[in-house]
Amino acid sequence: MSSKYPRSVRRCLPLWALTLEAALILLFYFFTHYDASLEDQKGLVASYQVGQDLTVMAAIGLGFLTSSFRRHSWSSVAFNLFMLALGVQWAILLDGFLSQFPSGKVVITLFSIRLATMSALSVLISVDAVLGKVNLAQLVVMVLVEVTALGNLRMVISNIFNTDYHMNMMHIYVFAAYFGLSVAWCLPKPLPEGTEDKDQTATIPSLSAMLGALFLWMFWPSFNSALLRSPIERKNAVFNTYYAVAVSVVTAISGSSLAHPQGKISKTYVHSAVLAGGVAVGTSCHLIPSPWLAMVLGLVAGLISVGGAKYLPGCCNRVLGIPHSSIMGYNFSLLGLLGEIIYIVLLVLDTVGAGNGMIGFQVLLSIGELSLAIVIALMSGLLTGLLLNLKIWKAPHEAKYFDDQVFWKFPHLAVGF
């Protein structure tokens, strides 16, 4: 099997990516400058550590989590890094243009990078549904469209619904999931005869996927608390996320065993379900008043995740062409919705004293916010899917799906590397 790109893609990718990079450099040159206000080193280090945690989550966590395919592990990790690097650059500019541009130049702070990394994480969640079926040139398009759509969604939600940074970023779970699923729906689905083995998982890649899950598990409290305003909020968010992910691990492993006729544990279930609690508490992690509530949420999220992993892949594989091991999309869509529902419940409890009219109005606003996130995700996802189907990108042939050798140079072109 050839290890080279098709010639047209070899011409297309470097030209497309490097032109884009040059354009980004020019935009940074003309429109950005660093924050010049004084801040002592200790403050900077503390602020940078949060950004560092998010980068570890994105590069190592999500990079390795998606690397469980037998023949597509290299591409999963490296393409993730490529998308993260590109996504962060574009997200910094976009966030700056949308929020500060009228005042002149875009001021870059450590918070800008933190926010941009979280925006880029959205792409890394979505791409799980399409990795192995697209090339890098197509992924560049996906990054640009998704980061733009998320940035605009966040600005609209912030302006119309007056939500804070945390609340409008926590739509990322639902947004990323539905975006990824709608892109997958547009791509060619059936795997031709003889390629079924490629979307199966293998032991070593599965181990690296578990490593990715562990990194995400360790740093999820940082993600959920990164955009909160006060120390008490961050403390509560960290504690509640930790309790939730701890319980979802126990639930995932035991639930996976329970779901198997011989009581065996499924790697695929565990990879994804260990994170379930973190996604489910995301929206309300700082508001949960006691540990046991966070733990119950972690339990419910773990069960939903395992249940979803058992029953949804068949449907997703048929309808969306998503391989069995790429369960992040529907997992996050279910758990993200659970998180949003929990927040709506809190909102109802909060407005009880303010009269029935007030309850209806607040709930309507919250449902409107969620619906907007889903609609924009689906529409921009479909648009991306249609763009990715254009012939100019020279998408991999279905026979070359989930194959590292299409993209990478290997010294020994062995099939079972």
């Epitope: 403050g43 602020s47 933190r114 305003r229 006060s230 008490i232 509560n236 508001l287 809190l346 909060d350």
Partner: antibody, heavy 125, light 105 residues
């Protein structure tokens, strides 16, 4: 004892600049968000700017955006407000205040629990 | 927008005084009350609509939710003559009411 002490006020010409300082004692700026609030003669209180406890976010009132910059030096435990392109509308007593949060059911309630006595800024030709 | 009423109020020592604050949209219970005397630092009285700040006398109380809130001083003392402000913390920016000036009758 928790205290805030503002300084740096004075008379300045329209279009001029001024830097206000607010020295905190009894607590550390590293663990507290801080506000600047002003009161123009004969008017009510008007929120001006906020800096988060970790310095990561600065928010401004529309009336001062692009002209005022809130910053801090945690080694000196001091908050600053750099004011540029001043106009007569900026004439006021400027107060610094500590940001505090208490958990509500669906969000946090933020309030200003400690205030300084204020420093007067007069913009006049 | 926070609308305070009345804008000024005259009362006698020992009176029960009520100041109201109305929000243009529901702010649930995310409202604070401050007392301000000329030449002094403003002082937090009530946070989250009804919670008394530490050190504030119990004659001050806050109530209300949604759009209508009240600050009540049950037994007016000489040191209570000042200007009172409500402030919402439900959404940015953190707007104050125009103030109610309380003076001796």
């Amino acid at each position: 004892q928790v205290k805030l002490l503002e300084s740096g006020g004075g008379v300045v010409q329209p279009g001029g600049s001024l830097r206000l300082s607010c020295e905190a004692s009894g607590f550390t700026l590293r663990s507290s968000g801080m506000h600047w609030v002003r009161q123009a003669p004969g008017k009510g209180l008007e929120w001006v700017a906020l800096i988060w406890f970790d310095g990561s976010i600065r928010s401004y009132a529309e009336s001062v955006k692009g002209r005022f910059t809130i910053s801090r030096d945690t080694s000196k435990n001091t908050l600053y407000l750099q004011m540029r392109s001043l106009s007569a509308d900026d004439t006021a007593v400027y107060y610094c205040a500590r940001d505090k949060a208490v958990r509500g059911i669906s969000r946090y309630n933020y309030y200003m629990d400690v205030w300084g006595k204020g420093t007067t800024v007069t913009v006049s030709s | 927008v926070m609308t305070q009423s009345p804008s000024s109020l005259s009362a006698s020592i020992g009176d029960r005084v009520t100041i109201t604050c109305r929000a243009s949209q529901s702010i649930i219970r995310y409202l604070n009350w401050y007392q301000h005397k000329p030449g002094k630092a403003p002082k937090l009285l009530i946070f989250a609509a009804s919670n008394l700040q530490t050190g504030v006398p119990s004659r001050f109380s806050g109530s209300g939710s949604g759009t209508d809130f009240t600050l009540t001083i049950s037994d007016l003392q000489p040191e209570d003559f000042a200007t009172y402000y409500c402030q919402q913390s439900y959404s940015r920016p953190f707007t104050f009411g125009r103030g109610t000036s309380l003076d001796i009758k």
